[in-house]
Structures are given as structure tokens and as C-alpha cells.
């Protein structure tokens, strides 16, 4: 049962698993979710009636019935982990928190301009878990404006106490904000020979880079597959750091791989779901339950349905034996990952599926991609949406890309002579616009916001969101598109699809079905060969064809450019204009996305 | 002593090509972000292109994008910056630098070596 309610004055009785420390009780919430065990927990706020040395304490529970006995206790703030709740969460924090001091190892000091540019930098320092910043009206002198970067060995303060006219806050690198690098390489044959800062057991090279990402101390890993020489170590997942933050040594050995945090490309890739299933692999560890299951997905259905399940080993039946059925391990472990990992004994595991809510929705997968033909089908592209206009008739004005639960991002341009967004539905999930009928549920537009730089499509800044007045409940049909990680500005997409109901030609009329095409992304200085005329910016980016043939066209503005890249959808582009439609030599001309995602991350999450 | 030597620069005409090379002693390239960094009189110094040796993943700044490349040669310990397509905005004094920490690639900032730069001026 998902309770996210707080309960004031209120302590729960025993279960406790570890204590850290946390400036608020709804931060405490979300270090509980990230627990591999934390179903609860008991936050204790700053209080005269309570000892100081108590103060910012958060207390992570655990318990089989799932709740504790509950005594009341001032000052006690309790609440359940989300865990137990289908909604998406996120561990991105970027509440500042006045006159506390976050305690750590302050391993940089310098001085800054302000808060924000403090933790801009803490953002952009790979050891950095969060900081602490004296203002302007610190009492020494020699104090003022500087900025402590912290880190700790579990990414949480060791201690908060109050201070006055200081700020303390957390790195955004898990906002997706970081400038840091982001590498990806997987290099096999190689160990990384720097120091171990913990050892998990893991099937493959791909969860063991996952478990490295959210491990707060985690810069990078060597793996040991299950063909390496010395038995003891084989799915050995080691984590790793080093001072520089890079490996210092790197060793020659055949059957390990090693690989880096994927901290700085955080949103774009799934670091919580493990989805795969291991064939003839069992996963060891304590056990749960056993229940019959007829398959193993059956298996792993279970194990998600069963909130302390982490793991699971699922083994066929025997011919005839028990309705077909075979048995279902559900298991847990104090780190989430097994204790030991066997093969060749006919199991197959693989992990709960709870813990995707953790990652990006956009990261999940969708339909395989339906190659040739320029029509498309259902689900092929979830976060395509019509925007329509019901003023003065009802009719397709523009697409737009469902980017969050409660958020459209589509072009500008699109709200020329929109006075008001009551005239505004958003239809999702549909494939064919004849099936938007007068009883066809829609979403009405709470606010429009264009971008203040915006005032016409050819100069840029031709983006805006659109807030629904409710919230998308994510299917098969409707689910959001991933924003390009600003660690992923480097990428070469050369997987992108233009979609939209437009024209199919310059003097035409809007589609029955979505259209899809393949596109090439083109060099914006190509691309401003193309627009002699015209400012091709970096924050524009450009696709087509040099014969032409293929392009967006009127009635497709503001709908998305999509790339594929590492089997996740980036929305790259926002279709925004172009010189007619498939012109030879004229490519399309769209918004570049990941130049704005600042903007759309301060505007999204704005409270 | 750590030392980065910048050659290859010099005067072109728009549309021309030029490589520029940076060579290390007292440093290795293997393992560290190495960066091409360029400064035009009166303006900051810039990024213009990365490379993270191990694996040779590439960083490049908007603006050349498509038009350069940056490619190393672990045995000479070198890092190379090919330039076409160059325009009279390429102007500047380029600099090579070696990094000792993970870094965002193309903040001069968190370099700690530095060459001391080639000149490299594109004529219209």
C-alpha cells in the first residue's frame, strides 16, 4: 500500500536498519527509497524539546508486516518509503537549505560568487556529494563566500548542525545538470587497479556499471565475468575510486571488463532496472518466499508485486510435475544484489522490476520500430502527441512530445494568435485523427509557456511547454520521450525520426495517419550553407536529405525529432521551420533540445 | 617537469585546413582528458574539442562541430587537432592542456597543464 503522507509526532518502534543524517524528513523519504531495504523510517527535526546531537537524524526501517508499532514522539517525523508506490520518483534535490551545516570531508575549498554557483560546482566535480556555502554576512571575515565541496563514503552528510548565515545543499548531478564528462566505453580484456571501495556480485558487466552509477562513491568498476580464471572472483563487481577521479592503472586481463559511472549521463540511460533474465544462472540469497510460478516472467511478476523482493531465481517444472508449474525464489539481500551468483545448475533470475519507477519512464522500451513505409502504428511512437485548437472549429494545430507526467514540449510558434490555453486540447495515444471524436478524452492546457527569447521561428527560441491541467497516466501508448543528457552533447545520432499528421506536400492538407521518416542529421555548417540568409545557431540543429524527398512540413511543427541511441529515445529536435517542405538542399531546420534543457528542468520543476 | 609543446599553427585562407599537434613530456596522455583550447584577442579562452585517452570518447564545442577532429597518438604521446572547413572566426591562439581529474571536457578551468599556444589565423 503507498502511503506518502508524513506523520507528525510520530516515532516508529524498532526495525532500524541504519541511521544517516538528512536536512529534511522528505529527503529522508527519498534516501528510504533508495535503500535496497528501507520500507520506513523516523525523522527527527530540529527541536528544543530534543537532545541537539539528535537533530536531522533519519532512521531507516525495515519490517516483514511492512509497518512498525507507532509512538508518539515530538519532533518525530515518520513516513513510509515510496517503494510500496507506483509513481515515478527521483532523487534530484535542489532545495538549499539555510543556516545548516552539511558535515563531511571538505576536500576543496574556494570562494563563489553565490550559492548557485557553488553548487554548480559541486555539479560539476566528480567527488562531489554536496556542499556547504558561507554568504555575504558570515561573521569571519576570512570565511565569507566560500564554497566546501563534500563527499562521504554513503553520499549523505555525517552530521547537520545548525549554523547561522550559512547554506548547505546536494550536487544536481542526478537532475541530469552535470557538465562532467560522460563515458560510456565498456573496455573488455581490462582491469582498472585502483582502490575498491565495496564488492557486489552481479550476472553481467551492465548491472555491475548500473550498481557503480547509484552507488554514491562509485567512479568507475572492473568486472569479473563468469569465465574468469579464479572461481572466488567470477561475478565479482568491484566499485572502485581514485583521487583524480580516473583510473590510474589499467591492466591487460583476459575475461574482466571495466567501465565508468554513468553519473554525468544520468535520465538518458536505466540505472535501477535490471530487466534482463539470466539463463542457467541461480542468484543466491535470503529467502523470501517460494511460490509456483508458470514461467519465469510469471517469476519476476511476483518478485516486483512483492515489495521486499529484490531478486529472484526461477526453476522449470519437471515434466507433468505440480500443473506445469515450477517454483519461484523470491529473495532479498542487505545490498539488493545476490550473494553469490552459480551457473549450470537449469535457474533463471533476474531482478524485480520495481525499481524501473526509480529511472526515467522515457528509458523504458517500446514497440520495435516497424521499418519501410512512411505510415505508422500504434504505440510506435508513445509520446507523440496532437495538440488541437477548438477556436474557431476544432482542428490539428501542432505536435508536441509528452516530456513528464504533466508536460508537453513542442514549438513556439505554434501559439501565434492563441490568446488563451482554455482553446487547447492535448490528444495522446492517438495513431489516426479520425478517431479524436466530440467524447474523446483529452487534456486541457493550464498555462502555456514560451520561451522570453522567442519571437520568431527563423531567429530561435522556438520552444514551449505546455502544463496540463492533468496528470498523463503513463501506457503501451502514452509515455514520455527522454531529454538529451547534457553529458551526451557529444553523441552522434544516426538513428532520427521525424513525425507528425503534416503535410505530405507544400500545398496539401493534414494526414488521417502519423506519418513517420527517417532523417539524417546534417552539420549546422552545412546547414547554414543551405540558409545563406539566415543565423543557423547552436541552439538549432538541422536534418534532411541533400536530394530532398523526406522532411517535416506544415501541420508536424512542434512535434519531435526522435534519435535512438544505446536502445533509449532522445526527443533531439523540435520540428520549427525550414525553406518549403523535402526541398533539394534545404533541410528541415529544428530547435536543439539539449541546449535548452536548463530551461526546461527550471521551468518544469519550479515549485 | 611537465611540459605541452603546441605545434602547427600559422596563416590560411578561409576554407583551408590546417593540424595542429600537441606533444607531452613529464606528463602521460593515457588515462587524462586532454583539450584544445582557443582564445581570440579581448575574448575568454574556450573549448574547442576533448579527448578522454582510455577510450578515446571525443568532445567537441558546437561551433566546429563537423569541422574538426581530435584524434591521439598514444605511443608518441600526442594529441592531434585536424582543422577544416576554417573560417575567419577560427582566429585565435590555441592551446593544448592535460587534465589530472575527470573533468567537464571543455571548461578551461579545470585544466591544470597548459602549452603555450600556437597562433592560427584564418584570412577572408
Known amino acids: 500500500e503507498c502511503v506518502t503522507q508524513l506523520l507528525k509526532d510520530t516515532c516508529f518502534e524498532g526495525g532500524d536498519i541504519t541511521t544517516v543524517f538528512t536536512p529534511s524528513a522528505k529527503y529522508c523519504q527519498v534516501v528510504c527509497t533508495y535503500h535496497p531495504r528501507c520500507l520506513l523510517f523516523t525523522f527527527t527535526a530540529e527541536s528544543p524539546s530534543e537532545d541537539p546531537t539528535r537533530w536531522f537524524t533519519c532512521v531507516l526501517k525495515d519490517s516483514v508486516t511492512e509497518t512498525l508499532p507507532r509512538v508518539n514522539r515530538t519532533a518525530a517525523i515518520s513516513g513510509y518509503s515510496f517503494k510500496q508506490c507506483s509513481h515515478q520518483i527521483s532523487a534530484c534535490n535542489k532545495d538549499i537549505y539555510v543556516d545548516l551545516d552539511m558535515k563531511g570531508i571538505n576536500y576543496n575549498s574556494s570562494v563563489a560568487k553565490s550559492a548557485q554557483e557553488c553548487q554548480e560546482r559541486c555539479t560539476d566535480d566528480v567527488h562531489c556529494h554536496f556542499f556547504t556555502y558561507a554568504t555575504r554576512q558570515f561573521p569571519s571575515l576570512e570565511h565569507r563566500n566560500i564554497c566546501l565541496l563534500k563527499h562521504t563514503q554513503t553520499g549523505t552528510p555525517t552530521r547537520i548542525t545548525k549554523l547561522d548565515k550559512v547554506v548547505s545543499g546536494f550536487s544536481l548531478k542526478s537532475c541530469a545538470l552535470s557538465n562532467l564528462a560522460c563515458i560510456r566505453d565498456i573496455f573488455p580484456n581490462t582491469v582498472f587497479a585502483d582502490s575498491n571501495i565495496d564488492s557486489v556480485m552481479a550476472p553481467d558487466a551492465f548491472v555491475c556499471g548500473r550498481i557503480c552509477t547509484h552507488h554514491p562513491g562509485c567512479l568507475f568498476f572492473t568486472f569479473f565475468s563468469q569465465e574468469w580464471p579464479k572461481e572466488s572472483q567470477r561475478n565479482l563487481c568491484l566499485l572502485k575510486t581514485s583521487e583524480s577521479g580516473l583510473p590510474s592503472t589499467r591492466i591487460k586481463k583476459s575475461k574482466a571488463l571495466s567501465g565508468f559511472s554513468l553519473q554525468s549521463c544520468r535520465h538518458s540511460i536505466p540505472v535501477f532496472c535490471h530487466s534482463s533474465f539470466y539463463h542457467d544462472t541461480d542468484f543466491l540469497g535470503e529467502e523470501l518466499d517460494i511460490v509456483a510460478a508458470k514461467s519465469h516472467e510469471a517469476c519476476q511478476k511476483l518478485c516486483t508485486n512483492a515489495v521486499r523482493c529484490q531478486f529472484f531465481t526461477y526453476t522449470p517444472a519437471q515434466a507433468s510435475c505440480n500443473e506445469g508449474k515450477g517454483k519461484c525464489y523470491l529473495k532479498l539481500s542487505s545490498n539488493g544484489s545476490p550473494t553469490k551468483i552459480l551457473h549450470g545448475r537449469g535457474g533463471i533470475s533476474g531482478y524485480t522490476l520495481r525499481l524501473c519507477k526509480m529511472d526515467n519512464e522515457c528509458t523504458t522500451k517500446i514497440k520495435p520500430r516497424i521499418v519501410g513505409g512512411t505510415a505508422s502504428v500504434r504505440g510506435e511512437w508513445p509520446w507523440q502527441v496532437t495538440l488541437h485548437t477548438t477556436s474557431p472549429t476544432q482542428r490539428h494545430l501542432c505536435g508536441g512530445s509528452i516530456i513528464g507526467n504533466q508536460w508537453i514540449l513542442t514549438a513556439a510558434h505554434c501559439f501565434y494568435g492563441v490568446e488563451s490555453p482554455k482553446i487547447l486540447r492535448v490528444y495522446s495515444g492517438i495513431l489516426n485523427q479520425s478517431e479524436i471524436k466530440e467524447d474523446t478524452s483529452f487534456f486541457g492546457v493550464q498555462e502555456i509557456i514560451i520561451h522570453d527569447q522567442y519571437k520568431m521561428a527563423e531567429s530561435g527560441y522556438d520552444i514551449a511547454l505546455l502544463k496540463l491541467e492533468t496528470t498523463v497516466n503513463y501506457t503501451d501508448s502514452q509515455r514520455p520521450i527522454c531529454l538529451p543528457s547534457k553529458g551526451d552533447r557529444n553523441v552522434i545520432y544516426t538513428d532520427c525520426w521525424v513525425t507528425g499528421w503534416g503535410y505530405r506536400k507544400l500545398r496539401d492538407k493534414i494526414q488521417n495517419t502519423l506519418q513517420k521518416a527517417k532523417i539524417p542529421l546534417v552539420t549546422n555548417e552545412e546547414c547554414q550553407k543551405r540558409y545563406r540568409g539566415h543565423k543557423i545557431t547552436h541552439k538549432m540543429i538541422c536534418a534532411g536529405y541533400r536530394e530532398g524527398g523526406k522532411d517535416a512540413c506544415k501541420g508536424d511543427s512542434g512535434g519531435p525529432l526522435s534519435c535512438k541511441h544505446n536502445e533509449v529515445w532522445h526527443l533531439v529536435g523540435i520540428t520549427s521551420w525550414g525553406e518549403g517542405c523535402a526541398q533539394r538542399e534545404r533541410p528541415g531546420v529544428y530547435t536543439n533540445v539539449v541546449e535548452y534543457v536548463d530551461w526546461i528542468l527550471e521551468k518544469t520543476q519550479a515549485v | 617537469q611537465v611540459q605541452l609543446v603546441e605545434s602547427g599553427g600559422g596563416s590560411v585562407q578561409a576554407g583551408g585546413s590546417l593540424r595542429l599537434s600537441c606533444a607531452a613530456s613529464?606528463?602521460?596522455?593515457?588515462?587524462?582528458?586532454v583539450g584544445w583550447f582557443r582564445q581570440a584577442p579581448g575574448k575568454e579562452r574556450e573549448g574547442v574539442a576533448a579527448?578522454?585517452?582510455?577510450?578515446?570518447?571525443?568532445y567537441y564545442a558546437d561551433s566546429v562541430k563537423g569541422r574538426f577532429t581530435i584524434s591521439q597518438d598514444n605511443s608518441k604521446n600526442t594529441v592531434y587537432l585536424q582543422m577544416n572547413s576554417l573560417r575567419a572566426e577560427d582566429t585565435a591562439v590555441y592551446y593544448c592542456?592535460?587534465?589530472?581529474?575527470?573533468?567537464?571536457?571543455?571548461?578551461?578551468?579545470?585544466?591544470?597543464?597548459w602549452g603555450q599556444g600556437t597562433l592560427v589565423t584564418v584570412s577572408s
Open positions: 579527448i578522454y585517452s582510455l577510450g578515446g570518447s571525443t
Open positions: 592542456a592535460g587534465a589530472i581529474t575527470w573533468v567537464p571536457p571543455l571548461s578551461h578551468r579545470r585544466y591544470t597543464y
Open positions: 613529464g606528463y602521460t596522455f593515457n588515462n587524462n582528458f
